[in-house]
Amino acid sequence: HNTTVFQGVAGQSLQVSCPYDSMKHWGRRKAWCRQLGEKGPCQRVVSTHNLWLLSFLRRWNGSTAITDDTLGGTLTITLRNLQPHDAGLYQCQSLHGSEADTLRKVLVEVLADPLDHRDAGDLWFPGESESFEDAHVEHSISRSLLEGEIPFPPTS
């Protein structure tokens, strides 16, 4: 799998999209996990609703949300209030049984907030030693939630 780079601004929201073949992965729940080291395991951060038919419902774990458009074949992950420690390598996964197929490898980069003049020394970028061959960069246009704005639609 090639690695797709998503860049977001510290303090704002970053939306990551993972397209997939909706028929090939029909009936399968999805997950977002964080890669622990180059060869290490991928630690589950959040997964879609336990009932696949309800995968469109947004599920949160802390500041990370996941929702799945199972007809269109797009898994969407939202990282709210992006922080430097959120930077790193992740995977979108399709679950079947206890197994997981990788849908997309994602490198999250956290950029300094241009309006924040504090030291940006703790912001993370891939070092020279870390090569991501054929990496594709996607700039995610995002913004912070406005005051009083609800992060997800109210249930009627």
């Epitope: 028929m23 090939k24 029909w26 009932l51």
Partner: antibody, heavy 123, light 107 residues
Amino acid sequence: EVQLVQSGAEVKKPGESLKISCKGSGYSFGSYWIAWVRQMPGKGLEWMGIIYPGDSDTRYSPSFQGQVTISADKSISTAYLQWSSLKASDTAMYFCARSRTFYYDSSDYFDYWGQGTLVTVSS
Amino acid sequence: DIQMTQSPSSVSASVGDRVTITCRASQGISSWLAWYQQKPGKAPKLLIYAASSRQNGVPSRFSGSGSGTDFTLTISSLQPEDFATYFCQQADSSPRTFGQGTKLEIK
């Protein structure tokens, strides 16, 4: 009506090559995984591997990796199982089966099976 | 690989009897288990999936239960057409593995 129709019985000599087929009908062939399962005479069932005809994504059981090749041609709704050099121990009944994911538990089960192809390898 | 062990390997019973077949996995497989029926010279037929869900068209006398490592297939009242071999199969991980089979014979 969903159907998987397999090619006829084969009698081969050790060292010969063979390709057997499984033709699907009554459903969108490219949208379901197809598995191959071996049953040796009087024995149980062994999962050999699986293919997604939509993009030919193929997974093998470690026991069969390198021993057989699984392929598919979605344009003619057919999956294949082939050997480049048969052995007497390949004598068995081979089944293809459609693998369906049930959304209740996000795992896959074999809901339709072909009638089986008997392969006999003998000198 | 996950090993699936069925018991008994064969059982003799009469029409109308209640029969129970068990399947044990070598490690936990949640509820990712199927049961198949196979008659001589025929392909297997899916009876139960997800440990307890009956496949369309399968008579209600067939039921499945269990989770983790221990599973059961029960036929509440045997009919003449039920005499066959039954296999369990784990759908937890690859390679998918089957039990060795339980042959149900007429007493």
